[in-house]
Interface confidence: low
């Protein structure tokens, strides 16, 4: 018949609820053509009526809802001028109660279904939601482990579920549902969605960024205690080192009998896209051999380096 | 060196959408964090929501109803909107962003401002 | 909500003098940031993470602070530091800002 084989993914539905799917391939739809859908290689095409429980609308293929039965492949063909394509899907329907099992356990679930979100961070989810013009949808309602979510954390926007500080317990099976209105009937919408967290930041920059010391001098009274900090901003996946050194040796392992210099533990906190890092050196009593030595902060690559001076003497 | 240029309307009818643009050069758009602050006569600070790296929009709770922030990758603009203005939504408007050095949580680089007036 | 108050609203300082102003958060907030306002000018960044110093910012500037208590110190107050002076937190969405505090120089 001269129509070119397109075969697209597999879809795995959920039966009992309406399931719409969008005949588009840019390539081809972008210009005047006609779209016929048909199942199971038929020579009928689906119905155009739309009292029809499954029935073409416009470039869609609605089902309403979808059933066990309704597994199977199906084609839809794009006429254009000088043109023929046919396009497979294949639809695989199964019963699903979301609080019965997890969807954890089924096969090739599209990207649509799994999820990821970013620890520590501000982050979302979305409900894929595709029906033609003629399915209204009501506000979106959120669940996870089956109960609606609520708190502080969490809000809806749209299609969207916002979540805000990440933590690894908001791993886990969510599902988001809706209220499809057509031709005057009520449909239920609920899409099950298997989060799984990461620790993997989006920031571009791999270099770390030392905010302080900026190299320069400090002025410390002879015999004080003085304490400095070095902050050091990385990206939240990062495996570079933090210490101070002096004379390209660690400063505990240079003042490792006196321990009169020594380095602080590291602290960090996280930020919506790194971390910042915080080591300290102690000097416990500055001496005169401390001062003009550059004590240098290194974190991987970057280095930054601070030199006690004596105050200049006062003459008032 | 960052810059931030804002443009729009500065004056817009009650119940209208107020609608801003902010045009960045030397830096992506598609790095860091980029929002809108407003400042309401008399100097009151508002904060009004963001777009992130990844196109990730948060909005401000008082204002998630009206609050539309985009962005154009391909111009490196991003765009504010905001619907059903009402009077109180006279302001200064800003466009702001934070930058590697400062953490992006600061705002260290701002847009000139631009006063809008609500007014019929 | 967070809830930031700036005390005084309104201070006036000589020339020399050392202020402090105050932000007071309604709980517990990570660090803050300070903002410079000055009459028909953008915000600039002045101080962030609680003690940093953004570039060009005076060395007479510090912050300090932890918890729900920070604060501001100038030094040495000169003529060119008449401004208001915001903080912001971004510990907790919403992110908030104080209601300033305005510092004009006799």
């Known amino acids: 018949d001269g129509c070119k084989d397109i075969f697209m993914k597999n879809e795995i539905l959920s039966a009992s609820q309406p399931f719409a799917f969008n005949c588009t391939f840019p390539p081809i739809t972008s210009g005047e053509v006609s779209v016929t859908w048909y199942k199971n290689s038929s020579k009928i095409p689906v119905s155009k009526i739309i009292q029809s429980r499954i029935h073409q609308d416009e470039t869609w293929i609605l089902f309403l809802p979808m059933e066990w039965g309704d597994s199977g492949v199906y084609q839809c063909v794009i006429k254009g001028r000088d043109s023929c394509h046919r396009i497979h899907v294949n639809l695989t329907v199964f019963e699903k109660h979301w609080c019965d099992t997890s969807i954890g356990g089924l096969p090739n679930l599209s990207d649509e279904y799994k999820q990821i979100l970013h620890l520590g961070k501000d982050d979302s989810l979305t409900c894929h939601l595709h029906f033609p013009k003629s399915c209204v949808l009501g506000p979106i309602k959120w669940y996870k482990d089956c109960n609606e979510i609520k708190g502080e954390r969490f809000t809806v926007l749209e299609t969207r579920l916002l979540v805000s500080n990440v933590s690894a317990e908001d791993r886990g099976n969510y599902a988001c549902q809706a209220i499809l209105t057509h031709s005057g009937k009520q449909y239920e919408v609920l899409n099950g969605i298997t989060v799984s967290i990461t620790e993997r930041a989006g920031y571009g920059g791999s270099v770390p960024k030392i905010i302080y010391p900026k190299n320069h001098s400090i002025e410390v009274q002879l015999g004080t205690t003085l304490i400095v900090d070095c902050n050091v901003t990385d990206t939240k996946d990062n495996t570079n080192l933090r210490c101070w050194r002096v004379n390209n040796t660690l400063v505990d392992d240079y003042y490792d009998e006196s321990k009169r210099i020594r380095e602080g533990v590291e602290t960090h906190v996280s930020f919506r896209e790194h971390n910042l890092y915080t080591v300290n050196i102690t000097f416990l009593e500055v001496k005169m051999e401390d001062y003009g030595l550059p004590f240098m902060c290194h974190a991987g690559v970057s280095t930054a380096y601070i030199i006690l001076q004596l105050p200049a003497p006062d003459f008032r | 060196e960052v810059q931030l240029q804002q443009s729009g309307p500065s004056l817009v009818k009650p119940s209208q959408t107020l609608s801003l643009t902010c045009s960045v050069t030397g830096a992506s758009i598609t790095s860091g964090y980029w929002n809108w602050i407003r400042n309401f006569p008399g100097n009151k600070l508002e904060y009004m929501?963001?777009?992130?790296?990844?196109?990730?929009?948060y909005y401000n709770p008082s204002l998630k109803s009206r609050i539309s922030i985009t962005r154009d990758t391909s111009k490196n603009q991003y765009y504010l909107q905001l619907i059903s203005v009402t009077t109180e939504d006279t302001a200064t408007y800003y466009c702001?962003?934070?930058?590697?050095?400062?953490?992006?949580?600061?705002?260290?680089?701002w847009g000139q401002g631009t006063s809008v007036t609500v007014s019929s | 909500e967070i809830l930031l108050t700036q005390s005084p609203a309104i201070m006036s300082a000589t020339l020399g003098e050392k202020v402090t102003m105050s932000c007071r958060a309604s709980s517990n907030v990570r660090y803050m940031y300070w903002y410079q306002l000055k009459s028909g000018a953008s915000p600039k960044l002045w101080i962030y993470l609680t003690s940093n110093l953004a570039s060009g910012v005076p060395a007479r500037f510090s912050g300090s602070g932890s918890g729900t208590s920070y604060s501001l110190t100038i030094s040495s107050v000169e003529a060119e530091d008449a401004a208001t002076y915001f903080c912001?937190?971004?510990?907790?969405?919403?992110?908030?800002f104080g209601g300033g505090t305005k510092l004009e120089i006799k």
């Open positions: 912001q937190q971004f510990t907790t969405s919403p992110y908030t």
């Open positions: 929501g963001y777009i992130s790296y990844s196109g990730y929009t």
């Open positions: 702001a962003t934070g930058g590697y050095d400062y953490v992006e949580d600061a705002l260290y680089y």
